[in-house]
């Protein structure tokens, strides 16, 4: 006999990186017929939604109208059908950005390199932080972590055209509170025999960085179903 229901999906709209004082929506998608959804924050109950009518709703939205460092952290959700509860969702790491200062991002040997050259990014922030994050624009929003007292280096190794793109970095005051983003640095990789043209990102995936930038510039909500940056199994 089944003791739990399948875990729901959790994600943040428009992005898991939220500028301070901006709005974010945490979405939890379970099953039609779920009579209750619970959102947990750092292990404690945060909010409850009992959708009506439950048989016509399989997703609920929990609004956070004013993002701040107290609201940054790990969220998960569960749902209930009858008396049976689901497994908890994966953890959603909600990050508050635009805290305190702006780092400087530089690249060595320069922003235009030949395929196969070793490239290193440097992120510098003079205020008290020891962790830095490097993000590349595009659909993956892959985050690289680096450490240093005022500067971290991010060696990319020998680069290929796959490394082309626009990079930004953040200083991190803790896992869920980041600085303003640095100015962008565009890396151009040339000399690849097979393909020297800039290949566009896969258009079937949303550009999560672009969505984040829209949030920072306008504070608007976009109805994008952006999955949380941890893998959903």
């Amino acid at each position: 006999q089944q003791q739990t229901l399948p875990k729901p999906f959790i994600w943040a709209e428009p992005h898991f990186m939220v500028p301070k004082e901006k709005q974010v929506t945490i979405c939890c998608q379970g099953n039609y017929g779920a009579v209750e959804y619970q959102l947990h924050f750092e292990g404690s109950l945060f909010a409850v939604d009992r959708p009506k009518p439950p048989e016509r709703i399989n997703k609920v939205k929990f609004y956070i109208p004013d993002m701040n460092s107290r609201m940054a952290g790990q969220y998960s959700c569960i749902y209930r059908v009858g008396e049976l509860w689901s497994e908890p969702s994966n953890l959603l790491d909600l990050v508050v950005t635009e805290m305190y200062d702006t780092p400087t991002l530089s690249v060595h040997p320069g922003p235009e390199v030949i395929s196969g050259e070793k490239v290193t990014f440097y992120c510098r922030l003079d205020t008290a932080t020891s962790m830095f994050l490097l993000l590349k624009e595009g659909r993956s929003s892959h985050v690289q972590r680096g450490y240093g007292k005022v500067q971290a280096e991010f060696p990319l190794g020998p680069v290929t055209t796959a490394h082309r793109g626009t990079y930004r970095c953040f200083g991190s005051y803790n896992n869920h509170a980041w600085s303003f983003p640095s100015e962008p640095v565009k890396l151009l990789v040339t000399g690849d025999i097979e393909n020297t043209s800039l290949a566009p990102e896969d258009p079937t995936f949303p550009d999560t960085w672009g969505t984040y930038l829209l949030t920072t510039e306008t504070g608007l909500q976009k109805d994008h179903a952006l999955w949380d940056h941890t893998a959903q199994n």
Epitope: Q23, T25, F41, S44, L45, F46, A47, V48, D49, R50, P51, K52, V60, K61, F62, Y63, I64, P65, D66, R70, M71
Partner: nanobody
Framework: QVQLVESGGGLVQAGGSLRLLCAAS????????MAWFRQGPGKDREFVAA????????YYADSMKGRFTISRDNAKNTAYLQMNSLRLEDTAVYYC???????????????????????WGQGTQVTVSS
């Protein structure tokens, strides 16, 4: 901006009842989920009960379930907490709170965590004596 003012507190004997009121100013109150919290002497602030903006959904802390009832009258911009079968351990300052007013909240959502609340009243003292 939403301003909240609690009233109705006082001294009551164990087993007695009190009805707390939370009067709100501000046009958006009727669209905001709200809640009651309390802080007893030497204790942390704790969740008591929450209600959706529509009044159609409520949620209670386990120790208050069956004894306390939260309600609201949006036409009067007022929320209520009816407290019955009061116990000595219910002695506390009771606060009403409302969430931030820039989001289109679901009519069935309630928030149980104090960090979700942007607006707070000054509190009203409830003392339960033996």
């Amino acid at each position: 901006q939403v301003q909240l003012v609690e009233s109705g507190g006082g001294l009551v004997q164990a087993g007695g009842s009190l009805r707390l009121l939370c009067a709100a100013s501000g046009r958006t109150f009727s669209r905001l989920p709200m809640a009651w919290f309390r802080q007893g002497p030497g204790k942390d602030r704790e969740f008591v009960a929450a209600i959706s903006w529509s009044g159609g959904s409520t949620y209670y802390a386990d120790s208050m379930k069956g004894r306390f009832t939260i309600s609201r009258d949006n036409a009067k911009n007022t929320a209520y907490l009816q407290m019955n079968s009061l116990r000595l351990e219910d002695t506390a300052v009771y606060y009403c709170a409302a969430v931030g007013d820039s989001a289109p909240y679901s009519a069935t959502i309630v928030y149980t965590d104090a960090r979700a609340y942007a607006y707070w009243g000054q509190g009203t003292q409830v003392t339960v004596s033996s």
